[in-house]
């Protein structure tokens, strides 16, 4: 079958935009670290890169293949306010490269980390 | 308390990057439409904009305040392959602007849409 060039171009564009790659996401710091309900962070979220997007098959999963660690400084506020906001430095994993891996490879990778 | 200018700059930067705004997300088309298990799409996902990010308080929610409508063409493939890929057109709402709204405002907005 012959398909319109425009359709093929737009489909190719969609492939590129939705591929498995590091994507900027917002992490809610309080939720991520499960802090006490009277502890708040300002800003409440940080921006980090995590692998995301779609793989070409059900049996594949978008997984990180390399990671760097970032430190970010936020203000921590404890209620009731007995003192002002305290600067705290928190370390976050940043995914720097990703790959569509078979779920079996993912299982192997996780287990090799556990065995280390 | 006096805080280091660098700390304040990086915190301000984090606020900006994590604020409530339209963000590109990948939607798995097959999952979205809950299609038959032998129906596949190429590409499997489309890129759309949805409101996301963090609001400054628990009682606020990041919601869209304006929307535009887009159409994208993909290929549908039915297995076993007795015929070639067929083009399908998907229409959806793209969030074009967002605001942190109180959950009460969100409730009112949803109900005003239902009543229309």
């Amino acid at each position: 079958a012959h398909y319109n060039t425009e359709i093929l171009k737009s489909i190719d564009n969609e492939w590129r935009k939705t591929q498995c790659m590091p994507r900027e996401v917002c992490i809610d710091v309080g939720k991520e670290f499960g802090v006490a309900t009277n502890t708040f962070f300002k800003p409440p979220c940080v921006s980090v890169y995590r692998c995301g997007g779609c793989c070409n098959s059900e049996g594949l999963q978008c997984m990180n293949t390399s990671t760097s660690y970032l430190s970010k400084t936020l203000f921590e506020i404890t209620v009731p306010l007995s003192q002002g906001p305290k600067p705290v430095t928190i370390s976050f994993a940043n995914h720097t490269s990703c790959r569509c891996m078979s779920k079996l490879d993912v299982y192997r990778q996780v287990h090799s980390i556990i065995r280390r | 308390a006096h805080y280091n200018t660098e700390i304040l700059k990086s915190i301000d930067n984090e606020w900006r990057k994590t604020q409530c705004m339209p963000r590109e997300v990948c939607i798995d088309v097959g999952k979205e439409f809950g299609v038959a298990t032998n129906t596949f799409f190429k590409p499997p996902c489309v890129s759309v904009y949805r409101c996301g990010g963090c609001c400054n308080s628990e009682g606020l929610q990041c919601m869209n305040t304006s929307t535009s409508y887009l159409s994208k063409t993909l290929f549908e493939i039915t297995v076993p392959l007795s015929q070639g890929p067929k083009p399908v057109t998907i229409s959806f709402a793209n969030h074009t602007s967002c605001r942190c709204m109180s959950k009460l405002d969100v409730y009112r907005q949803v109900h005003s849409i239902i009543r229309r």
Partner: nanobody, 118 residues
């Protein structure tokens, strides 16, 4: 047990219109997605149109501009308005509904015959 019942099929002349409907009974929840497949004699079942709670709508290019899908959540019903019908639209039309997280997630109707012929 969820059951889907289709209606509205029949014999129509080329250029004519039909409105199919499909109602679900046995569930108090609205399905997340609903849609229509069709199967012509000797051919594979193909997706015609679908709609989701996420605000997405899908049409096969062969029916785009002629068919319109709509849903009524209060009645757990999906409709397919078919205009400017052609001989190649002749098929058995099956509706499906998809509940996220249920088991099974998808339920199917028994099919309704649409014949376009002069």
């Amino acid at each position: 047990e969820v059951q889907l019942v289709e209606s509205g099929g029949g014999l129509v002349q080329p250029g004519g219109s039909l409105r199919l409907s499909c109602a679900a009974s046995g569930s108090s929840f609205s399905p997340y997605a609903m849609g229509w497949y069709r199967q012509a004699p000797g051919k594979q079942r193909e997706l015609v149109s679908a709609t989701s709670e996420g605000g997405f709508t899908l049409y096969a290019d062969s029916v785009k501009g002629r068919f319109t899908i709509s849903r009524d959540n209060s009645k757990n019903t999906v409709y397919l308005q078919m205009n400017s019908l052609r001989a190649e639209d002749t098929a058995v039309y099956y509706c499906y509904m998809h509940w996220r997280g249920s088991d099974p997630e998808n339920y199917w109707g028994q099919g309704t015959q649409v014949t376009v012929s002069s």
